[in-house]
Structures are given as C-alpha cells and as structure tokens.
C-alpha cells in the first residue's frame, strides 16, 4: 500500500475554496522530489495539473498553487474558484504520475445549498455584526416585527419589537425600526457565533396578512493563512479586523490545547515571557488594523496564531478575528549566530549580526529593544554614519566581517546596557535579529587609563595593556567617528606589568600623537580582533588643550582621570517604536523609505533569537 | 470545556452494520476536526477516520483497513459526526472513541485531538 495519505473525500461549493493537503513520510528523499496533483481519466491515465517543479496547468491558471513543506512531510494543494466542473477523482502523489507513490482523492463540487425562495443569503466571519433586512407593507406598520431561527422543524423567537430577547442573543442584538418613510425594519447581530448560522424568519404582523422574509446566515471561521518562515527569522502577523473594533483591546494569541489561545501580547500591556525581547505591536491605525513582529523564530514557536478584539485583551466567543499556522522551517537559511553576548561593567561586547548576503548593500541597524507599552526599539546606530548621542565613542557599527555578516561593537558598559538588542537591514524584512546582551562580574580584560588630556603641538602615548589570553590576536589603536573606527599606527612595548599571574605573552601596545592638533581630540579605542572578527575593545577620550609647560606627555594608568559619568538618554532619541513595524524601509516590502538620519525621532526595527548559544564579551 | 459522548455501540453479527454518533456538548468554539479512533483489546489506539470541516468544505479521511466499508458524516453546526459501520468484520471489535480536535491542521490520524469521548464497546461475532 501506498505511504501517502490524504483526505479520501473532499466536498465543496461552487466558488469555494479547498485546501488539500497531503501525507508523505518525511525521508531525505521524500522531501526533495516532485510532489503532484493530477486528475484521473476514464482510461486510467492521470493528467498533472500543478507540481511542485513550478507546472500548473492551464486549467488551474490564476487559481492554483501547490506548496512542500518538507519539515511536516506534507505538501498542500490550494484549489480556488471551483466549479462543478472540478468534481472529479484526483491523486496527490511523488515523484512520476505513473509511479505507486500516490493517494486517491475524490473531489465533489456542488451547487450549494438549496434556498427556500426569496431567500437573502448573508455571508459574514466570525465575531463580526450582520444587519437582517426586513421589508414589511404599510398594513403591517404598526403591527408587531420578530424575527426567528428555524431550529430542526420549529421557528424559535429571536427578537421581537415588544423588548423580547432570547437569552442566546442577550447584550449583543437589537430590532431597529426605520422611520415612518421606509417600510424597512432591520435587526442587527453583533459578536456573530458559529452558532448563530442557519435560517431565519422574519415577519412583520402575526395574522395571514402578515409580511415575512426568508434569511439566510452563513457564518464563517476563519481560514487559517499558512505561513511559512525560518527558524532564527521572523514573522509579521497584519490584522485587520475593521473600524467597528477600532477602539477596542487587540490580541494577538496562540492557540494551546482545545480552546485555549494563550495570549502572545496584547494592547492592555501583556506579552508571554517566551516572547520577551523578541516582539513589538505594532499600534493600530484609525481603521483597527495593527500588526505584530516576531523575531528570532523558535522551533516551539510553530502554531495557529490569531489576532482579534475584546475589551479583555483576550479571546472570548464573539470575538472577530484572523487566524494563522505557522510553520517554522528548520533547514533556516539564517545562520546561527549568538543569541547571548556577555560583557563585564566597564568592558565591551562584540556582537555579530547576520543579513542577507544577497543585499550587502542595504543599511544596517542595531536598536535598543523597550518592553514598555507594546514594545519599541530605539534606534542607536546605522551603517550610514548614524550614531545616537548617547552612544558617541562607545559605539560603532562595522560592515566587518562582510558576506551576510556586520559586527556592532559597544563598549564602556554599564549595568544599565543589559536588554535585548535587534539587528535589522532595510532589506530583507525576515532577517531581524535578536541578542541579548547580559552584564556579569567582572573585571575589563583591556587596561587603558580613563580620560586623556593632550597639549597642543606635543606628542602624547596612550598605553592599553593587553593580557596573555589575547596573545594570538591582533591588536590595534583606531580612532572612533560616527562612521567606524579608523585604524591607527601603534607601537608594541613589550610585556605589561598590569596584570598578575600572567607571563611574557601580555603586551602593552601604546598609541602615539605625535605635534597633537584640535583635529585630535575624541575618542580612541585600543582592541584585538582575528582578521575581520572583533574581540574585545577599550575606549579613552582625548582631551587637547593650549600648551602650559613644554614636553611630551606620557599617560600611565595611574594618572587616568576618572571615567566620565555615563549620559542619560534624553528624550528626543530616534527610535524605532511601534510605528517603526510601518516604517516601509524596514517592515514593509513594496515602498522605499526617505532618510531618517535627519529625523529626530526616526523609525526602525528588527529582531532574532534563536539558538540557545551565548558569546563571551571578550572574544567571539 | 467540551465533553463528547459516543453511542449506538453494541454486539453486531459479522456482515452485519452498526451506526456510531458522537455529540459534543459545551462551548465548542472552533471545532474544526472530529475523529474515530479504535482500541481493540490488548493493542494500541488506532485511527479509523476523521471529518474535517474547513472554509466551507469538507475533508473526509479513512484508515486502509476499513475504507468502502465505513462512513464518515457530520454536522459541524450541531458538532456531531457520525460513522455508519457495514460489512463489519470480527478484527472490527474494539473500543470506539470520538475524539475533537480545535485546529484543521496536522495529520488527522494522528494523537493531537484536544478531547477524546469515554468510548463505546462494538463487538462483532462471527
């Protein structure tokens, strides 16, 4: 018998959708050859209609697609705009039609529903409000309105225009009478359940004169989108639930056991701690809509997903929603990278952001992940030469290593740098990043004396002393700008004496100015890296001031001013909040973005976690 | 919460037909896969078939074992489903149980329903 295993019978409407999915034991090669869908003749032949090589016949033009998921050991075949002419026996199968490896399908395409005459067919989704019309003549005007639900054989009161209300319909009906003019009455459901639908009744007077109207109400689930996206990537989920619950808390959930949808976050404030440092709601426009961005896919994040509203900020009955599966793809094109960097109060970090190779030349971000309200993330720095005020000289941003890899560099920590930050491009939306950076005890690795104060026209040498575990790397002295660190002449000086217990292979490498000008003050950084991997790095500013005595200066750590107190953020940073995920140049795929570098409060984002990895602070 | 109660199980001759119901009961909220299952003595759980309703079609699955002899039916509005049993054979006895799923995803044969019935005794002689 065959291993492929499908739905042996699929029956469906005229204009209807299906949506067929097929079994298939998830072997190598099970999940590489071709997956078809093909219509059995009267001879026994098996005609293709769509394959997974990118055929779809002509037949199935505009309104087919078929799609692997090789994870699952599944692939599905959409089918849109059916006619009756679809009805049929079909196999969804691999590799060659005339092959065993196959499963027979019939499909039955029917008419629909029979409708008594005269009946007005209302299609509306689940959660959402239907507004029953009911035309009376004027002999009927002053005479009672209802309306019923054929329940089996008999008519069940639903509403009438003497105040009753079936307890089923309590707190979310109401009979509306127009006004004299109009022979119209109408009644209006709102937070539509599944069992609201069927056939309804009604009628204006109660004797033979009386005037009644046949309804019909279809009320739909909603159809689950499949999305499909990397582990390590991200997701956008975009909700559009319609200016009626514009005011009203959204969710956004995830559907557990049975009935349970766990809420993921919500606009009331709450987020899952699974989520922590990898999400933003993004806030809703005029029109309801709102979307939420996930980033470093997880295996366990895999699951149907809806939005909705309710004064709650969770889901109940009634409530209108969209739903989603989302699949999580594990053969990920997103490299693993670190989601943990770790640094010592006063040291640094050096963190390595992954991007699409094919898109070297788009901009790059690193932002400062916010929980408050539905989550933000301020913007610190960009590849274009962007630095936050608060970061000047302690961070830098570098297209180092290249090839779908940057590093972003942040020194002179403090126990207020610890978060998640996220890298993002302006490019692709799915490669959104995450690390979480964690201070811990510790002492810097690199010893540099704190601020420097420089004589104009004389010569200064700054000493960093470097211990023995960096004795295979290189080390150098640059010069932070706002654009990188740019390389500086140095000198090594044999072993350091600032470090116990450490032997010939510590080095103090010292960084000399030589006729010091204006143009050298700032900061300087002294740091190791492996080719055009980044290590560890200390920063020192330069100070430059008119001459007072002659001579040479010579900083030892001694003399080291104290470190400058850290700079409070102010409030007019960039940041990339929740208006950011409509920042087309980051969250959405059709428009490009104006420069924000100019903007005072500019928008960006993005994000990963993934694997459980951590980085040392010290060293990648 | 949601219950399902399984009936119409019964003592049956070899060749001869029996129909199952299941109903469920409580908030059902978006039941959107019913299935059959079966436990004969001594042996594992084993899938039977599944009703899956979505986006207005439906979806009906069967076992190897009993396909051409079993039926699948259901009224997703009422979320009942019943499974009419002809031709039935001796290795047909075991335990039938309902069991309801909330999402139209996942392979039906397999054990990710959210609830299951208490299960039903069908025996068939020879």
């Known amino acids: 018998k065959s291993p492929i295993f499908g739905p042996e019978e699929v029956n469906s409407v005229e204009g209807n959708s299906v949506s067929i999915t097929c079994y298939y034991p998830p072997t190598s090669v099970n999940r590489h050859t071709r997956k078809y869908w093909c219509r059995q003749g009267a001879r026994g032949g098996c005609i293709t209609l769509i394959s997974s090589e990118g055929y779809v016949s002509s037949k199935y033009a505009g309104r087919a697609n078929l799609t692997n998921f090789p994870e699952n050991g599944t692939f599905v075949v959409n089918i849109a705009q059916l006619s009756q002419d679809d009805s049929g026996r079909y196999k969804c199968g691999l590799g060659i039609n005339s092959r065993g490896l196959s499963f027979d399908v019939s499909l039955e395409v029917s008419q629909g529903p029979g409708l008594l005459n005269d009946t007005k067919v209302y299609t509306v989704d689940l959660g959402r409000t239907v507004t029953i019309n009911c035309p009376f003549k004027t002999e009927n005007a002053q005479k009672r309105k209802s309306l019923y639900k054929q329940i089996g054989l008999y008519p069940v009161l639903v509403i009438d225009s003497s105040g009753y209300v079936n307890p089923n319909y309590t707190g979310r009906i109401r009979l509306d009478i127009q006004g004299t003019g109009q022979l119209l009455f109408s009644v209006v459901i709102n937070q539509l359940r599944l069992s609201d639908a069927g056939q309804y009744l009604c009628q204006a007077g109660d004797d033979s004169n009386s005037n009644k109207k046949n309804a019909d109400l279809q009320v739909l689930k909603p159809e689950p989108e499949l999305v499909y996206e990397d582990l390590r990537g991200s997701v956008t989920f975009h909700c559009a639930l319609g200016p009626e619950v514009a005011n009203v808390a959204k969710f956004l959930c995830r559907q557990s056991s049975g009935e349970n949808c766990d809420v993921v976050v919500n606009t009331l404030g709450k987020r899952a701690p699974a989520f922590e440092g990898r999400i933003l709601l993004n806030p809703q426009d005029k029109d309801g809509s709102f979307s939420v961005v996930i980033t470093g896919l997880r295996k366990e994040d895999a699951g149907r997903y809806l939005c909705g509203a309710h004064s709650d900020g969770q889901l109940q009955e009634g409530s209108p929603i969209q739903a989603w599966q989302l699949f999580v793809n594990e053969e990920s094109t997103i490299p693993r990278s670190p989601t943990v960097v770790k640094g010592v109060a006063g040291g640094s970090v050096a963190v390595l952001c992954p991007y699409n190779r094919k898109e070297s030349k788009s901009i790059k971000y690193w932002c400062l992940w916010e929980g408050a309200q539905n989550g933000r993330c301020p913007l610190l720095v960009d590849s274009e030469g962007w630095v936050k005020a608060q970061y000047e000289g302690r961070l830098s941003l570098l297209e180092e290593p290249g090839n779908g890899t940057f590093t972003v560099i942040l020194n002179q920590l403090t126990s207020r740098d610890a978060g998640f930050y996220w890298c993002l491009t302006n490019g692709d939306t799915l490669w959104r990043t995450t690390v979480e950076i964690k201070i811990i005890e510790g002492e810097p690795n690199l010893k540099v004396p704190g601020n420097v104060t420089a004589v104009l026209g004389e010569t200064l040498k700054v000493p960093c002393h470097f211990p023995c575990k960096f004795s295979s790397y290189e080390k150098y002295w640059c010069k932070w700008n706002n654009t990188g660190c740019q390389a500086l002449p140095s000198q090594d000086e044999g072993p350091s004496k600032a470090f116990v217990n450490c032997d010939e292979n510590s080095r103090l490498v010292s960084l000399t100015l030589n006729l010091v000008t204006r143009a050298d003050e700032g900061w300087y950084w002294c740091g190791v890296k492996q080719g055009h991997f980044y290590g560890e790095t200390a920063a020192v500013y330069v100070a430059v001031e008119e001459r007072k005595a002659a001579g040479s200066r010579d900083v030892s750590l001694a003399k080291a001013d104290a470190a400058p107190d850290e700079k409070v953020l102010d409030s007019g940073f960039r940041e990339i909040e929740n208006k950011a995920i409509q920042d087309p140049r980051l969250f959405a795929e059709e428009k490009a973005v104006a420069d924000t570098r100019d903007q005072a409060d500019g928008s960006r984002a993005s994000v990963d976690s993934g694997s459980s990895e951590e980085q040392g602070g010290s060293s990648r | 919460q949601v219950q399902l109660v399984e009936s119409g199980g019964g003592l049956v001759q070899a060749g001869g037909s029996l129909r199952l119901s299941c109903a469920a009961s409580?908030?059902?909220?978006?039941?959107?896969?019913m299935g059959w299952f079966r436990q004969a003595p001594g042996k594992e759980r084993e899938f039977v078939t599944a009703i899956r309703w979505s986006g207005g079609s439906i979806y009906k699955y069967y076992a190897d074992s009993v396909k051409g002899r079993f039926t699948i039916s259901g009224d997703n509005a009422r979320n009942t489903v019943d499974l009419q049993m002809n031709s039935l054979k001796p290795e047909d006895t075991a335990v039938y149980y309902c069991a309801a799923r909330m999402s139209p995803w996942g392979d039906p044969r397999g054990n990710e329903y959210d609830y299951w019935g208490q299960g039903t005794l069908v025996t068939v002689s020879s």
């Open positions: 409580g908030r059902a909220f978006s039941q959107y896969t």
